[in-house]
Amino acid sequence: DCCSCQEKWVGYRCNCYFISSEQKTWNESRHLCASQKSSLLQLQNTDELDFMSSSQQFYWIGLSYSEEHTAWLWENGSALSQYLFPSFETFNTKNCIAYNPNGNALDESCEDKNRYICKQQLI
Amino acid sequence: ARHCGHCPEEWITYSNSCYYIGKERRTWEESLLACTSKNSSLLSIDNEEEMKFLSIISPSSWIGVFRNSSHHPWVTMNGLAFKHEIKDSDNAELNCAVLQVNRLKSAQCGSSIIYHCKHKL
């Protein structure tokens, strides 16, 4: 049914999320999400994950720097809104972005291991 | 925000249950009443997997398990004996149960702790 998420996924506001408890590199995380017909988290706004705003973990999200566009892009090619992470100008463009659902974001080496969040839109 | 599915708006769905993820702190009894007013129950834990999931969401929350005193057994809201281990049970002042990062422990029922509500689909 179009309103249901896969088993072990969280449904919230018409989206399904897989919240990993295992740690992976950014690339491993991206492939794991793709294998589940989803993509690494693309945030619409910082309260998108407010159901887990008490979490004190960081999670890989689907943001990477494009040399070609000289911009931070989501996996679908759309640009990062400058209002989402006010500190994004200080991010090292060689790094990937780890996000805490409280609204904090860090740039870390893509080879580092973090938990990750996959997202699927229901409709 | 759009709304889909079988759970109340702003609740989450997980494994055929709906969860209200509270951000406000309440005593155990206040939490019980708050969940009742939402036509649901104070959080119950059915298995290890659910406990792990909820621990990712929030570091601690009340669960619907209590005892009348340290001489009484731990029971669920429907009066059944609660089988799982609850830490610090030897302390006579701690008669309500809390989920705290992958383990269950006793706490003072009058403490202000975050609460979550649940109802099964």
């Epitope: 740690q23 590199t25 008490s54 004190q56 973990q57 960081f58 790094n95 805490n100 409280n102 904090n104 870390e108 080496s109 080879e111 580092d112 291991k113 973090n114 | 621990s55 570091p59 601690s60 990062v101 702790i113």
Partner: antibody, heavy 120, light 107 residues
């Protein structure tokens, strides 16, 4: 169970060097940020440095920047701190520390500490 | 940098007393706060994380509360082994910082 054992401390003259090591066991070392924290005699706790899981993301306190180098060997479950151009104010007990599994930046486990004394 | 200020810097109390130590952050840190206990010659030990969550193995007489900028550590009934120095620490943003410590002494 989790164990962190530091070694390499000792007495050194100002301007000298020391290399601290920390042997980790009882957990998947490559899954955790690792930290060095120090405590001067009779004083409080001070963050010195930390290193990410792969060793690529590193932080140093301003007081040690350019003089200390943190590194890790995930194959050997070991953390290191190379300390050069040591000063009297670097005298402290140095603790190797591991993050808590739930809260990034909170120290869940500490080593027993190794004393570094910088004196002529 | 976020400054962490503990008060009092020292406190005298007796076995059985209820003791409260406060910690104030110079800016909001949500609930990214930890409390540690340190005894002379020993490494610190984690008591509380996420402002109010009790670390496994820590006695339930220890509790933490607060959010934002103001936090408290409470020991409900002091035991002889609780006389030590207590530190708060923020983990909200780099560089992570500790409070200056509160020494709890026997009256």
């Amino acid at each position: 169970q989790v164990q962190l054992v530091e070694s390499g401390g000792g007495l050194v003259k100002p301007g000298g060097s020391l290399r601290l090591s920390c042997a980790a066991s009882g957990f998947t070392f490559s899954d955790y940020y690792m930290r060095w924290i120090r405590q001067a005699p009779g004083k409080g706790l001070e963050w010195v440095s930390h290193i990410s899981t792969s060793g690529s993301t590193i932080y140093y306190a301003d007081s040690v920047k350019g003089r200390f180098t943190i590194s890790r060997d995930n194959a050997k479950n070991s953390l290191y701190l190379q300390m050069n151009s040591l000063r009297a104010e670097d005298t402290a007990v140095y603790y190797c520390a591991r993050d808590h599994y739930y809260s990034r930046g909170v120290i869940g486990y500490w080593g027993q500490g190794t004393l570094v004394t910088v004196s002529s | 940098d976020i400054q962490m200020t503990q008060s009092p810097s020292s406190v005298s109390a007796s076995v059985g007393d209820r003791v409260t130590i406060t910690c104030r952050a110079s800016q909001g840190i949500s609930s990214w706060l930890a409390w540690y206990q340190q005894k002379p010659g020993k490494a610190p030990k984690l008591l509380i994380y996420a402002a109010s969550s009790l670390q496994s193995g820590v006695p339930s007489r220890f509790s933490g509360s607060g959010s934002g900028t103001d936090f408290t550590l409470t020991i409900s009934s002091l035991q002889p082994e609780d006389f030590a120095t207590y530190y708060c620490q923020q983990a909200n943003s780099f560089p992570y910082t500790f409070g200056q410590g509160t020494k709890l002494e026997i009256k």
